[in-house]
Interface confidence: low
Amino acid sequence: CPTSCKCSASRIWCSDPSPGIVAFPRLEPNSVDPENITEIFIANQKRLEIINEDDVEAYVGLRNLTIVDSGLKFVAHKAFLKNSNLQHINFTRNKLTSLSRKHFRHLDLSELILVGNPFTCSCDIMWIKTLQEAKSSPDTQDLYCLNESSKNIPLANLQIPNCGLPSANLAAPNLTVEEGKSITLSCSVAGDPVPNMYWDVGNLVSKHMNETSHTQGSLRITNISSDDSGKQISCVAENLVGEDQDSVNLTVHFAPTITFLESPTSDHHWCIPFTVKGNPKPALQWFYNGAILNESKYICTKIHVTNHTEYHGCLQLDNPTHMNNGDYTLIAKNEYGKDEKQISAHFMGWPGIDDGANPNYPDVIYEDYGTAANDIGDTTNRSNEIPSTDVTDKTGREH
């Protein structure tokens, strides 16, 4: 642990001014793992003037950074690039004359305290005023800056010509497209200072390319993948003062696929587990030995987890007997197509022939996802019913 600091497994604390620190604290290679540090508190360190680009990067788990009553004058633009967990930054009473939005724009900060710094009045710090105004909290900070006459003026009163927030405008508010197709999005931006424009496509899987001039831009997405359904695409306008974005949600329609269908497992019920993907939501239909399976309260489809366009569930059977052994087929369909898969189920041997469960179907407990969703599928045809399963438990209560 650096001199003048205290270190624990999760905190670094440097508050005693003598002898003090001249550089941002770094841990010795064989000491505490810097990834586990969640809080760094620095106070009264008048000789600490700079946070360099690589000073903080090792502390990837850092949530709270406090540097108060110290000599901080300069923070490198990419200083916090690797610190995506940062939530609270307190730079009270330092020597900062300017501070850029770029330090913090990728962070989801819930607190940025900058009181008591000798900021210079310019468009460079207008973003701080904008940030203050956007806060609904009543305890806004008393921030000041020095104007050309070296007068301290409240940041709240700062007026700088041609220094305002930009705007972004995206043509399509909702976007639904079929898998495999291509689309082009257009966006226009405006503002003074003239903003930069960029596209934020997150983790878009589909191939995309953009053409951007200063105030106009287009994004072409080709051969759209079903994996991109539900993703958000944003057009961002950014200048010194701040940013504006206009976003569109991408909905991709695609034919169903049954990605998982397994032999039955026994928990409190027997379950034939499945996973189906599709958008719009596929209708599900079960067949038993080639005939439509009419569901009842004893044999029914349960969806446990819905993950956007993916459905995890079970064909649930209460106390099945040898009469329920056989082939089970799941069909999933929507307007873009259908998919089917089949498994063989063996619940119990025939009486007198095979007393135990077939060893080919061991009792592996299927993880119940815990939240029952509405069943999907239509089961109106009541012909070819398969034998009902036992409907009471040992207490005589119905299941």
Epitope: S15, D16, P17
Partner: antibody
């Protein structure tokens, strides 16, 4: 050798002004806080205030705010404690010390008596 | 009224272990390290313990420091007659933006 050397004992009358000094040597004077501590006869140590000579950032203990002035001249590595109008109750031993407290001055005895 | 609270006096016989407490708040001891000073009559205080439990060179290991929450303690084991002195705790205080002292504890070796 790191040391703080204070000016000599003073005998003053009530209402007079006084400025006592504390000269640092053997270390970077501008980079460490220097504080002034009062010890009245038979009493404990009391922090009066502290100054950072590098930028003259000065903080006073609430009970001494407005009663004394702490200053520093970094060009000669010296900190000062000053009264504009002394009172009999200012009679005490005054120590300067660098925070971290590994360095203390030898003390300056101030006696205020009519 | 000192910001940090110490008992005004403590005593012990030679060879005994004596503990002096120092109680503060979250703005001082709760968040900062504690220093302890020893002062003999007519002399300037001397640093006895820094960073709560670190001894400067020359201070015997009979002296030890500890902290729990907003309280700190100085323990002297194997008490000797030359330990008879005044002991003060101090810490930086965030509310006052400077250091604060305890009122001091007069240790008597019986």
């Amino acid at each position: 050798e790191v040391q703080l050397v204070q000016s000599g004992a003073e005998v003053k009358k009530p209402g007079e002004s006084l400025k006592i000094s504390c000269k640092g040597s053997g270390y970077s004077f501008t980079s460490y806080w220097i504080g002034w501590v009062r010890q009245m006869p038979g009493k404990g140590l009391e922090w009066m205030g502290i100054i950072y000579p590098g930028d003259s950032d000065t903080r006073y203990s609430p009970s001494f705010q407005g009663q004394v002035t702490i200053s520093a001249d970094k060009s000669i590595s010296t900190a000062y404690l000053q009264w504009s109008s002394l009172k009999a109750s200012d009679t005490a031993m005054y120590y300067c010390a660098s925070w971290g407290m590994d360095v203390w001055g030898q003390g300056t005895l101030v006696t205020v008596s009519s | 009224q000192p910001v940090l609270t110490q008992p005004p006096s403590a005593s012990g016989t030679p060879g005994q272990r004596v503990t002096i407490s120092c109680s503060g708040s979250s703005s001082n001891i709760g968040t900062h390290t504690v220093n302890w000073y020893q002062q003999f009559p007519g002399t300037a205080p001397k640093l006895l313990m820094y960073s709560t439990f670190q001894r400067p060179s020359g201070v015997p290991d009979r002296f030890s420091g500890s902290k729990s929450g907003t309280s700190a303690s100085l323990a002297i084991s194997g008490l000797q007659s030359e330990d008879e002195a005044d002991y003060y705790c101090a810490a930086w205080d965030d509310s006052l933006n400077g250091p604060v002292f305890g009122g001091g504890t007069q240790l008597t070796v019986l």
